[in-house]
């Protein structure tokens, strides 16, 4: 199809080489309530284009995205050629940053309901650049946490070094929905609820003498509880003795509950005590068996191929630790009688 009639938007993505970062493009097709409509491109130059309100935002789930190769080749369907780019309804998600994402992206509705070739499309010229060292040292992260039940804020990473007074007007989106009243470089959240978790996008316009473009940043916001004040507790084993059969295989499970920590480095390991000696056992990897907002339950097993007489004299100790402290639970094996 002919893309010469597409409306054009220029965007800049300045990514940090230090952090994982995502990016999004919205298919900003004209809506009936907007002043710019799509017009039929089959009219002769002397005819006045017949303005057609295109489609409401509710219809935008069925759009097609293409990339325009720089060498002038035909348009490429995004879904077929770019595994690191995902289409979700009318939004294009870039999962990894890189200058190779620079280029022209075109979106248009899949179904053209008019008998004419309707030039109803948007061309987005995306420029992707790594952030220079000269940029602000303490720019806001692309991953921000909000503490449930408290007051918090979401900062636009590309503007976080500017004061509110010198900041340009910002356009914010939450999960693709325009937040029309939020216009500053920082959104104040009076009281944080689960509702506030999501993908936020902040846009502002930058101009030079020649042209203007939209600078965009994406912020993943997570709602969290406060860091735990407790050391982990061991849920299993509960008993300090365990009846076993000699010569049989045995698995002892250690399950521990760790309270939420923003920087989470849980330790769960088994070691063996035999008279004055003690040593750590190499056991299978720990696995998370339940994770909630407040805590996580992690399990790690010790496996004995067969229980020996020597094992009855040893103590098997599960050791768990977080930043607050550690807890241990020891198990003595006891031979099952008759």
């Amino acid at each position: 199809f002919n893309i010469s009639g597409c409306s054009t938007k220029k965007l800049l993505w300045t990514y940090s080489t230090r952090s994982e970062e995502e990016f999004v493009l919205f298919c900003d097709l004209p809506e009936p309530q907007k002043s710019h409509f799509c017009h039929r491109n089959r009219l002769s130059p002397k005819q006045v284009p017949e303005h057609l309100p295109f489609m409401g935002s509710n219809d935008l789930s069925d759009v097609q995205w293409y990339q325009q190769p720089s060498n002038g080749d035909p348009l490429e369907d995004i879904r077929k050629s770019y595994p690191h780019i995902i289409q979700d309804k009318c939004t294009l998600h870039f999962l990894t940053p890189g200058v190779n994402n620079s280029g022209s992206y075109i979106c248009r509705p899949k179904m053209i309901k008019s008998p004419y070739d309707v030039a109803c499309c948007v061309k987005m010229i995306l420029e992707v650049k790594p952030q220079t060292n000269a940029s602000c040292e303490y720019s806001a992260s692309h991953k921000q946490d909000l503490l449930l039940g408290s007051t918090g804020s979401i900062s636009c990473p590309s503007l976080s070094c500017q004061s509110d007074a010198q900041s340009p007007a910002v356009t914010w989106y939450k999960n693709g929905k325009l937040l029309s009243v939020e216009r500053s470089n920082r959104i104040v959240v009076d009281e944080v609820y689960d509702y506030h978790q999501g993908t936020y996008v902040c846009d502002y316009t930058q101009s030079d003498t020649v042209s203007s473009w939209t600078v965009r940043a994406v912020v993943q916001v997570r709602t969290i509880v406060g860091d735990t004040k407790l050391k982990p507790d061991i849920l299993d084993p509960v008993e300090d003795t365990l009846e076993v059969e000699l010569g049989k295989p045995l698995t002892i499970s250690c399950k521990a509950r760790f309270g939420f920590e923003r920087v989470f480095n849980p330790v769960i390991k088994w070691y063996i005590k035999d008279s004055d000696l003690e040593w750590e056992v190499s056991v299978p990897e720990a696995k998370s068996i339940k994770s909630t907002l407040k805590d996580e339950i992690i399990e790690r097993n010790i496996i004995l191929e067969k229980v020996t007489q020597r094992d009855l004299r040893r103590k098997f100790v599960c050791f768990v630790q977080n930043s607050i402290g550690n807890t241990t639970q020891s198990v003595q094996l006891k031979e099952k009688r008759g």
Epitope: K177, V181, I187, V188, V189, D190, E191, Y193, H196
Partner: antibody, heavy 118, light 111 residues
């Protein structure tokens, strides 16, 4: 409960401050304290809200910005300062409490009447 | 600011009948909408919040529905006591749950 006070008959161009006093609870996080007005025989019109928690954020209807100021003056009182009053500001002014993540008004005062007339 | 448009301005129905009031938001407000009932000389009373959740003590004859920009309040099995003016209200402002713009109101007359 909530009770408004300060309603009066004033001349055009005058200023007036209304006070909302809470009984049985004090303003805290999770509460928005707000002002709503209703001109005689007309509908409800939102004026402004203030968050009672630490951010102290204020929110105004676009028509109210600049002429109306909402403030939390204590843990149980909120005021609405009104300047350059005109006859169009004649209304019953209600104080209302918005709570939690539902954002609705679950508690209202009985209202106080402001009349602007020469 | 979001603009709330309520229709009709007035509606009349017989006791035992049903009335439907519509409310349209100028932008997507998800399900952050409340409905109030107001009788002359009284402050409004909350009926429904979050578009469809009945406030405490409100009879189940009152039903709220909708999300995004289109909302409806339906009152069935009308009683004389339902004669009042009904208002919708947007209850989200940006990302904060701030009660704000009201619809123009609908007067319900019960015959």
């Amino acid at each position: 409960s909530l009770e408004e006070s300060g309603g009066d008959l004033v001349k055009p161009g005058a200023s007036l401050t209304l006070t909302c006093t809470a009984s049985g609870f004090s303003f805290s996080s999770s509460y928005y304290m707000c002002w709503v007005r209703q001109a005689p025989g007309k509908g409800l019109e939102w004026i402004a809200c203030i968050y009672a928690g630490s951010s102290g954020s204020t929110y105004y209807a676009s028509w109210a910005k600049g002429r109306f100021t909402i403030s939390k003056t204590s843990s149980t009182t909120v005021t609405l300062q009104m300047t350059s009053l005109t006859a169009a500001d004649t209304a019953t002014y209600f104080c209302a409490r918005g709570a939690g993540s539902n954002g609705d008004f679950n508690l209202w005062g009985p209202g106080t009447l402001v009349t602007v007339s020469s | 600011d979001v603009v709330m448009t309520q229709t009709p301005a007035s509606v009349s129905a017989a006791v035992g009948g049903t009335v439907t009031i519509k409310c349209q938001a100028s932008e997507d407000i998800e399900s952050y909408l409340a409905w109030y009932q107001q009788k002359p000389g009284q402050p409004p009373k909350l009926l429904i919040y979050r578009a469809s959740t009945l406030a405490s003590g409100v009879p189940s004859r009152f039903k709220g529905s909708g999300s995004g920009t289109q909302f409806t309040l339906t009152i069935s099995d009308l009683e004389c006591a339902d004669a009042a003016t009904y208002y919708c209200q947007c209850t989200i402002y940006g990302v904060n749950f701030v009660p704000n713009a009201f619809g123009g109101g609908t007067e319900v007359v019960v015959k």
